[in-house]
């Protein structure tokens, strides 16, 4: 039975040209995290395997930095980066947990972080 919960940074906004940390956290389970995949709609951004380290998709390699932790730092933001991002936690023995983050990249300096929220 899957008892875990993914906590994410929720709905967030950031300024064009700036950086943002995409972060998820898996709690309420003793399952071992073997890998975390980061995806934007149907595009793979990065993979972090607990043993094998990071894979960064070449289309993002100049703008994505691994970490902190299992998170991902997205740099040099453009308005085209607006959209949904997913952290997909592969765990043993539970299986797969998915968290969602919505990022809005703003032209002006009115960007502010949204509240953290949980996805069961």
């Amino acid at each position: 039975m899957m008892t875990g919960t993914i906590e994410t940074t929720g709905n967030i906004s950031a300024e064009k040209g700036g950086s943002i940390i995409l972060q998820c956290h898996l709690s309420s389970t003793t399952a071992q995290v073997t890998q975390v995949n980061w995806e934007q709609q149907d595009q793979l951004l990065a993979i972090c395997n607990a043993a094998l380290g990071w894979h960064i998709s070449p289309s993002f390699k100049d703008r994505v930095a691994p970490g902190p932790g299992l998170g991902l730092t997205l740099q040099s933001l453009t308005v085209n980066d607006t959209g949904e991002y997913f952290c997909i936690y592969h765990t043993y023995p539970d299986g797969t947990y998915t968290g969602r983050i919505f990022l809005e990249v703003l032209e002006s300096s009115v960007a502010e972080h949204g509240a953290r929220f949980q996805i069961p």
Partner: antibody, heavy 119, light 107 residues
């Protein structure tokens, strides 16, 4: 120039073990993971597992877990794969392979080591 | 485990022809797919990574495309030296898995 030099062919008896080496040169050994791939009948490729030489962390294909052990010797920049309790199904060519920088695709391969299990 | 299926074990083609080799994943693997060429008696050689990126030094007649479950490897104009087995591989999730290989034969 990156090179992965594997040990020579092995003829072993059923039930025995084999340990294959992969000596690397031309890059910083601890900065890249090392993987092992089995090729049976000259065609089908199977990923056995990978090891992070920096911290010894391993990821195995469950099919081989318990029978395969991946290790490294950082002082000689050499990776090893030991396979135990061999049967005729283990007769194959075994490759070590190194992925790229922040990329899991395997861009450098050893020349392969032929293992024949026969009584 | 994710199964990678290369439906054609053999493909016969002529020099100068365009050839498409397909690979289907049993579940979505985004763009985490590589293609390797293996000539007789040699080790596999990386041609395409992340579904569509040509590896350093690979001739531009080799291209890759696809995302999700369906992937295609294309040789735009086959040369005699392209006689080989072509393997697809997913690295979306361990265990990394390969297709069964497609042997390209030159008529």
């Amino acid at each position: 120039e990156v090179q992965l030099q594997q040990s020579g062919p092995e003829l072993v008896k059923p039930g025995a073990s084999v340990k294959i080496s992969c000596k690397t040169s031309g890059y910083t050994f601890t900065e890249y993971t090392m993987h092992w791939v089995k090729q049976s009948h000259g065609k089908n490729l199977e990923w056995i597992g990978g090891i992070n030489p920096n911290n010894g962390g391993t990821s195995y294909n469950q099919k081989f877990k318990g029978r395969a052990t991946l290790t490294v010797d950082k002082s000689s920049s050499t990776a090893y794969m030991e396979l135990r309790s061999l049967t005729s199904d283990d007769s194959a060519v075994y490759y070590c392979a190194r992925p790229g920088w922040y990329n899991y695709a395997m861009d450098y391969w050893g020349q392969g080591t032929s293992v024949t299990v026969s009584s | 485990d994710i199964v990678m299926t290369q439906s054609h074990k053999f493909m016969s083609t002529s020099v100068g022809d365009r050839v498409n080799i397909t690979c289907k994943a049993s579940q979505g693997v985004s763009t985490a797919v590589a293609w390797y060429q293996q000539k007789p008696g040699q080790s596999p050689k990386l041609l395409i990574y992340s579904a569509s990126y040509r590896y350093t030094g690979v001739p531009d007649r080799f291209t890759g495309s696809g995302s999700g479950t369906d992937f295609t490897f294309t040789i735009s104009s086959v040369q005699a030296e392209d006689l080989a087995v072509y393997h697809c591989q997913q690295h979306y999730i361990t265990p990394w898995t390969f297709g069964g290989g497609t042997k390209l034969e030159i008529k």
